[in-house]
Interface confidence: medium
């Protein structure tokens, strides 16, 4: 149905030997990403958080699909993870490596 | 070709007629709103200043396009414009209606 | 620091077009909107019309069509475009800034309008 | 479509206070804020009170606006009048149609 299609966080785990990303981070060797997936139709939930740019446009798109895109369902808030990497050629320790992690996501 | 259908900021004129908002926004009658459009595929360029998790996302679709969507091409910067607006009946001057006009956009 | 300046002609024939510029400095007309007020020789303002920030425009209906007005933002500039010009249109034209209220006006350019 | 009505002069001592009117013809005055302008001969006006009763930076706080809703009138009040206050002031307002409208101006004279 068109609610289970919604705009929400999903599952999406990283490998970071699949994306080449173990040639420098050590530790740890994948982790839980998430994706926001699904639709921004109009109305626009609250929980979405949809700037008013993104309601006008879903407005839009509603009347007159060719006039503009849907507003897109994209990470709001994001979370950092702790990772070990190399630092010429030096391992170290990064506490928060921002913007790794979807927390929310959104209608923008 | 593909740098031509790359993530930007395209024309969107919203007419506050045609979305029903002209009555409690009295002026202006509408305004560049713009929208962002196009494909955010990897790699993705440093002025659509991507978080890293669409970096990693973008790079997981190139790789394997079933387990992760691609990034999103959405407003990343936006700009208040002035209107003139009515509130319990009361004709109201808000300088900075925020959120309104896509200023930049990039992939998320 | 903030300046608007207002260029154009002194003197139009009536029924030629009126074309002036007002040449901004000191912010953006992306962030602040630009009014156009114009003031007859001893008499009162008129509003004319406003360049909205976000690029809509709004005019007074008193100049039915025969009014553009229109912006070169990468050039900082506002202008101001009217036909069938009139006696009666000769005036002060200012352009001013509004932001929360009116803050900045340029100096003003007397236009007469005779033959 | 409203017009603002202002007495055309008025006249004034140093020292003195004074009350210059802004009457809304039709339509309640309080429905938009109103705006005073003060221009001295040869220059261009600058804003003295804006939303009804907010002085802008440098504004001396001899100027106040305020709201009579029995008289549908605004009112800019001018304490200690200084010869410097001789000027034409301008009431400004919005309508909905028009969208920004002026009254006829009052010249203050400082005797």
């Known amino acids: 149905n068109a609610k289970g299609n919604y705009c929400k966080r999903t599952p999406l785990y990283i490998d970071f030997k699949e994306i080449g990303w173990d040639s420098w981070i050590i530790a740890p060797p994948g982790y839980e990403a998430y994706e926001c997936r699904g639709v921004c139709n109009y109305p626009l939930a609250e929980h979405l958080t949809p700037t008013k740019h993104a309601i006008i446009q879903a407005l839009v798109h509603l009347k007159n699909s060719q006039k503009a895109s849907k507003a897109c369902c994209v990470p709001t808030k994001l979370e950092p993870i702790s990772i070990l990497y190399l630092d010429k050629g030096v391992v170290t320790y990064k506490f928060k490596y921002e913007g790794m992690a979807v927390s929310e996501c959104g209608c923008r | 070709n593909a740098k031509g259908n790359y993530c930007k900021r395209t024309p969107l004129y919203i007419d506050f007629k045609e979305i029903g908002w002209d009555s409690w926004i009295i002026a202006p009658p509408g305004y560049e709103a713009y929208e962002c459009r196009g494909v955010c595929n990897y790699p993705l360029a440093e002025h659509l200043t991507p978080t890293k998790h669409a970096i990693i996302q973008a790079l997981v679709h190139l790789k394997n396009s079933q387990k992760a969507s691609k990034a999103c091409c959405v407003p990343t910067k936006l700009e208040p414009i002035s209107i003139l607006y009515l509130d319990k009946g009361v004709v109201t001057y808000k300088f900075k209606y925020e959120g309104m006009a896509v200023s930049e956009c990039g992939c998320r | 620091q903030v300046q608007l300046q207002e260029s154009g002609p002194d003197l139009v024939q009536p029924s030629q077009t009126l074309d002036i510029t007002c040449t901004v400095s000191?912010?953006?007309?992306?962030?602040?909107?630009v009014h156009w007020v114009r003031q007859p020789p001893g008499k009162g303002l008129e509003w004319m019309g406003t360049?909205?920030?976000?690029?809509?425009?709004d005019y007074n209906s008193a100049f039915k069509s025969r009014l553009a007005i229109s912006r070169d933002t990468s050039k900082n500039e506002v202008f101001l475009k009217m036909d069938s010009l009139q006696t009666d249109d000769t005036a002060k034209y200012f352009c001013?800034?509004?932001?929360?209220?009116?803050?900045?006006w340029g100096q003003g350019i007397l236009v007469t309008v005779s033959s | 479509q409203f017009v603002l009505i202002q007495s055309d002069s008025m006249s004034t001592s140093a020292g003195s206070t004074v009350k210059l009117s802004c009457k809304r013809s039709?339509?309640?005055?309080?429905?938009?804020?109103v705006y005073w302008y003060q221009q001295h001969e040869g220059r261009s006006p600058t804003t003295m009170i804006y939303?009804?009763?907010?002085?802008p930076d440098g504004v001396p706080d001899r100027f106040s606006g305020s709201i009579d809703s029995s008289s549908n009138s605004a009112s800019l009040t001018i304490n200690n009048v200084q010869i410097e206050d001789e000027a034409v002031y301008f009431c400004?307002?919005?309508?909905?149609?028009?969208?920004?409208?002026f009254g006829g101006g009052t010249k203050l004279t400082v005797l």
């Open positions: 001013a800034r509004l932001g929360y209220y009116v803050d900045y």
């Open positions: 939303d009804g009763d907010k002085r």
């Open positions: 000191g912010f953006s007309l992306t962030t602040y909107n």
């Open positions: 039709t339509g309640n005055i309080g429905s938009s804020y």
């Open positions: 400004q307002s919005f309508s909905s149609g028009i969208k920004f409208i």
């Open positions: 360049m909205w920030n976000g690029g809509g425009i």
